[in-house]
Interface confidence: medium
């Protein structure tokens, strides 16, 4: 028999109480770890890093800071104004040897457009990465650099769940041992070919992403090149077999009737925490019909809610969810119609997603106002439209090109959209900002491994 | 020019205790992280221990038996070193931030 492989990554999550704070309950909060989690784990799955196949994560243990938790001495994410630097070294600055990453998700409006930030891992000789165990580094300070953080905000606006999800990919990228994407066959979106640059540019990709291109969500040759040297040094250090659930990470997986936490997490009467004996521990007290942990549909006094209790809000593109009465779980809400618009007039729903361009509404396709191309860079922050397969017809919604449709009315991109061929965000104020891809892990790795740039720490 | 100058290694039976010195020459202006590192045979360089400030930091597997300490008026910063063990064996190496590195001295644990 074959000994079974190392290939799962096990996660240490914490949200801040930002975080907390916009998504509103421990309960939505835990759906989108989840959600990102299950994201990250259907990339890696289905990714062939030369030979090693079916890398997957699991979440060994969550920490959710409360607004409660705002206040907290020891709570280390307290702090309202601080640098993503600041935030990814915060991170660091715990033990996290149990874990093969350690990740903190926030609702931070970082600057210029920053997403996230994670340590890249290295075959030999690495600081930093997946792996990484906790040690002294030349600030004087332990840190653990098996580390990252991804945020939902930019710009003042929040990034769509498939942006999200694909930072989050990003980051754990970096971890694994990718660099940003280079080079003409790693970087297609950049291509003056059309055929290529339709398919947009890969998850290593350093500036901005949409999310709903062709390569968005598969790894490069070059990531796939630098990722497999890392992965065949490392994963026996810290990956685990796959299979058994984990009961007291907060996610209720095979094999679990609920999952609350541990015992100093819990606050779920319905459910046996962590703490309790093998045949109790993540099982439903007796009597108990359900466990909030399991979906939002359970009350605090573990039963079913009733048939017509919301359970989801309306969006743009899809409508309330209501409980059936006899799960726990939110039941998927119905689709609004097909080219309904939404995200403020500058999208249309496709299959009860806020996924397509208000371009298609009239049979045309988005495109880049780009100031390569010579337009002015006012425009570069507006919904462009062009005819389908010819960029030579790319024009402002608000051009007399398009008025027909849009009756000379501008429609300008939501703040932190990608603009300028993705090589930025729009800001608040319609500029396209130009994301800087490397500076922010550029001046940590400086303050951690050459502090003596960095005068007069403490005396 | 300001240089570090180590002292204090030696041979040692496992158990046995050692204190290293540091001291430095020339002012310097703007110190804030001393440290000493470890360099075993065929290994890297690694941090044991630092001081900055009034905080002390140990590598785990010194902790509890190392001590960090500096003398300002002396300038110099020790490292006392308690029940030493075969794999503490060394060159021992002070680092001043802004200071390039010393010779080192050389500490070796018997078993």
């Known amino acids: 028999t074959t000994s079974a492989e190392k290939n799962t990554c096990q996660l240490y999550i914490q949200t801040d109480h930002l975080f907390f704070k916009y998504y509103g309950t421990r309960e939505a909060v835990i759906a989108q770890i989840s959600s990102h989690v299950k994201a990250i784990d259907t990339i890696y799955q289905t990714t062939d890093f030369s030979g090693i196949r079916n890398i997957s994560f699991m979440v060994k243990r969550i920490r959710i800071n409360t607004t409660a938790d705002e206040k907290d001495p020891t709570n280390p994410f307290r702090f309202p104004n601080i640098g993503v630097e600041k935030f990814l070294e915060l991170n660091s600055e715990q033990n996290h040897d149990d874990y093969c990453l350690a990740y903190v998700f926030t609702d931070r409006d970082f600057d210029d457009g920053v997403l996230g930030l994670a340590w890249v891992g290295a075959p030999s000789g690495s600081s930093g990465g997946i792996c990484e165990k906790s040690k002294l580094y030349s600030d004087g300070k332990k840190k653990s650099l098996n580390t990252g953080i991804i945020t939902v905000q930019n710009y003042g606006s929040h990034v769509p769940p498939k942006v999200s999800h694909i930072t989050f990919a990003h980051e754990v990228g970096h971890n694994f041992g990718s660099p940003h994407d280079s080079g003409t066959e790693c970087t297609p979106g950049e291509s003056k070919n059309l055929g290529q640059k339709e398919n947009g540019n890969y998850i290593m990709y350093a500036r901005a992403t949409s999310g709903d291109k062709l390569n968005n969500n598969k790894f490069s040759l070059c990531s796939i090149r630098n990722i497999s040297q890392v992965l065949e040094k490392k994963r026996n250090n810290c990956f685990v077999e796959s299979g058994q659930p984990i009961c007291g990470n907060g996610m209720v997986e095979q094999g679990e009737e609920c999952d609350c936490g541990y015992s100093d997490q819990c606050k779920d009467e319905c459910c046996f925490d962590a703490n309790q004996p093998e045949g109790r521990k993540c099982k439903l007290k007796p009597g108990k019909q359900c466990s909030p942990s399991q979906g939002p549909c359970c009350t605090a006094q573990c039963a079913f809610k009733s048939k017509s209790e919301k359970c989801r809000d309306d969006s743009d593109c899809a409508r309330e969810g209501i409980c059936n009465g006899f799960t726990a779980l939110c039941p998927a809400s119905d689709p609004k119609p097909n080219f309904t618009d939404c995200n403020r007039h500058t999208q249309v729903c496709i299959n009860g997603q806020c996924a397509g361009s208000i371009c298609e509404k009239y049979g045309l396709e988005e495109c880049t106002c780009a100031s390569s191309d010579g337009k002015d860079d006012k425009e570069l922050c507006h919904v462009c439209c062009m005819k389908k397969m010819d960029p030579s017809t790319c024009a402002s919604t608000g051009s007399v090109q398009w008025s027909r449709h849009f009756s000379g009315r501008t429609i300008t991109l939501q703040p932190g959209s990608p603009c300028n061929d993705f090589r930025g965000y729009c800001d608040v104020f319609m500029r396209c900002r130009l994301v800087d891809a490397d500076g922010p892990l550029a001046r940590l790795k400086k303050a951690i491994f050459s502090p003596e740039l960095y005068e007069n720490i403490a005396e | 020019e300001v240089q570090l100058v180590e002292s204090g290694g030696g041979l040692v039976q496992a158990g046995g205790s050692l204190r290293l010195s540091c001291a430095r020459s020339?002012?310097?202006?703007?110190?804030?992280?001393m440290a000493w590192y470890r360099q075993a045979p065929g290994k890297t360089r690694d941090m044991v221990a630092a001081i900055i400030g009034d905080s002390t930091n140990y590598a785990d597997s010194v902790k509890g038996r190392f001590t960090i300490s500096r003398d300002n008026a002396k300038n110099t910063v020790y490292l006392h070193m308690n029940r030493l063990k075969p794999e503490d064996t060394g060159v021992y190496y002070c680092k001043i931030s802004g200071v390039d590195w010393g010779q080192g001295t050389q500490v070796t644990v018997s078993s």
């Open positions: 020339g002012r310097i202006s703007n110190i804030n992280i």
